[in-house]
Interface confidence: medium
């Protein structure tokens, strides 16, 4: 049998059974998550679960820009440094940039400082680009 690769929505890119949408619009973290959800298919702000996934995403985004941070689906809802993925994925792979995670910074972004391969925490009300993900 021929195994067909599932198709993503127009403009979204496919990698390892997932579709990703890079939104070059300014949204705070919660509005970004709501916009991801509005696309259905169980879409959320993206979870990044391996270095391979991180590298693919980073390469794609670098084709557009190299200076703006991007919201991902990692947050600290209890504000106790207990980070979790909004889509329910296991928080095993970690790629923090090593910066201080104190203060009122309870949402995670892909940092442009290391070509989007590492994450930083930031204030959730900041308006930034964002990355959505769903499984087709």
């Amino acid at each position: 049998d021929i195994i067909m690769r599932p198709s993503c929505a127009p403009g979204w890119f496919y990698h390892k059974s997932n579709c990703y949408g890079y939104f070059r619009k300014l949204r705070n973290w919660s509005d970004a998550e709501l916009e991801c959800q509005s696309y259905g298919n169980g879409a959320h702000l993206a979870s990044i679960l391996s270095l391979k996934e991180a590298s693919t995403i980073a390469e794609y985004i670098s084709g557009y820009q190299r200076s703006q941070p991007i919201w991902i689906g990692l947050h600290d809802p209890q504000k106790r440094q207990q980070w979790q993925w909004i889509d329910g994925a296991m928080y095993l792979y970690r790629s923090w940039s090593g910066k201080s995670m104190g203060g009122n910074k309870h949402c995670a972004e892909m940092s442009s400082n290391n070509n989007f391969l590492t994450w930083s925490s930031n204030e959730c009300n900041k308006r930034q680009h964002f990355l959505c993900k769903y499984r087709p």
Partner: antibody, heavy 127, light 109 residues
Framework: EVQLLESGGGLVQPGGSLRLSCAAS????????MSWVRQAPGKGLEWVSA????????YYADSVKGRFTISRDNSKNTLYLQMNSLRAEDTAVYYC????????????????????WGQGTLVTVSS | FMLTQPHSVSESPGKTVTLSCTRS????????VQWYQQRPGSSPILVIF?????PSGVPDRFSGSIDSTSNSASLTISGLQSEDEGDYYC?????????FGGGTKLTVL
């Protein structure tokens, strides 16, 4: 009052050069990215080039890359477009435009909308 | 990619008109869309930015929206007035460039 005033247009032969200027007033010029947009007679708008507030980043449409150079002198509140190797298809009204900035967010130059436009200057390339 | 707009649209005063702008490839939702009005003999004016935001001074008769299903943006003008006549351009951006639609000529009958 926020104002942009272009000058330097005129008639030039194919292969010739021209430098357009855009004098800005009424705002802190160095804080804003700027663009040149052109409009051929009876045609639509075509973005030509953009420059960041500091002048450190510049961007060009493929149609003018290597022939046109955008620059700015923040001490004189003036934007420039140096146009070399001009062609008949460069004939157009050239507008300078300011890029709007919201909330002090340091954002990519060309992503901002253009909220203030000059009155335009006509460049005619013909022999 | 390209932004495609209808060449011309006509409507009577007081009516509502919707101008469309369709993106040929890539998602219309990924990048902000702006709309510019250009009255005859004048410079362009920004009437909608960031998909649906109105600059101060632009009447609330002007509204913008995005439809990811049709991959298009729309500019709706209600209570059409004679001074609304002119060309309307949608605009978005791509990797290091601004992209304009071809423009729609709006005639108020």
């Amino acid at each position: 009052e926020v104002q942009l005033l272009e000058s330097g247009g005129g008639l030039v032969q194919p292969g010739g050069s021209l430098r357009l200027s855009c004098a800005a007033s009424g705002f802190t010029f160095s804080s804003y990215a700027m663009s040149w947009v052109r409009q051929a007679p009876g045609k639509g708008l075509e973005w030509v080039s953009a420059i960041s507030g500091s002048g450190g980043s510049t961007y060009y449409a493929d149609s003018v890359k290597g022939r046109f150079t955008i620059s700015r002198d923040n001490s004189k509140n003036t934007l420039y477009l140096q146009m070399n190797s001009l062609r008949a298809e460069d004939t157009a009204v050239y507008y300078c435009a300011r890029h709007y900035q919201s909330g002090g967010y340091v954002y990519i130059t060309f992503y901002y909308p253009m909220d203030v436009w000059g009155q335009g200057t006509l460049v005619t390339v013909s022999s | 990619f390209m932004l495609t707009q209808p060449h011309s649209v006509s409507e009577s005063p007081g009516k509502t008109v919707t101008l469309s702008c369709t993106r040929s490839s890539g998602s219309i939702s990924f990048d902000y869309v702006q709309w510019y009005q250009q009255r005859p003999g004048s410079s362009p004016i920004l009437v909608i930015f960031e998909d649906d935001q109105r600059p101060s001074g632009v009447p609330d008769r002007f509204s913008g929206s995005i439809d990811s299903t049709s991959n298009s943006a729309s500019l709706t003008i209600s209570g059409l007035q004679s001074e609304d006549e002119g060309d309307y351009y949608c605009q978005t951006y791509d990797d290091n460039r601004q992209v304009f639609g071809g423009g729609t000529k709006l005639t108020v009958l």
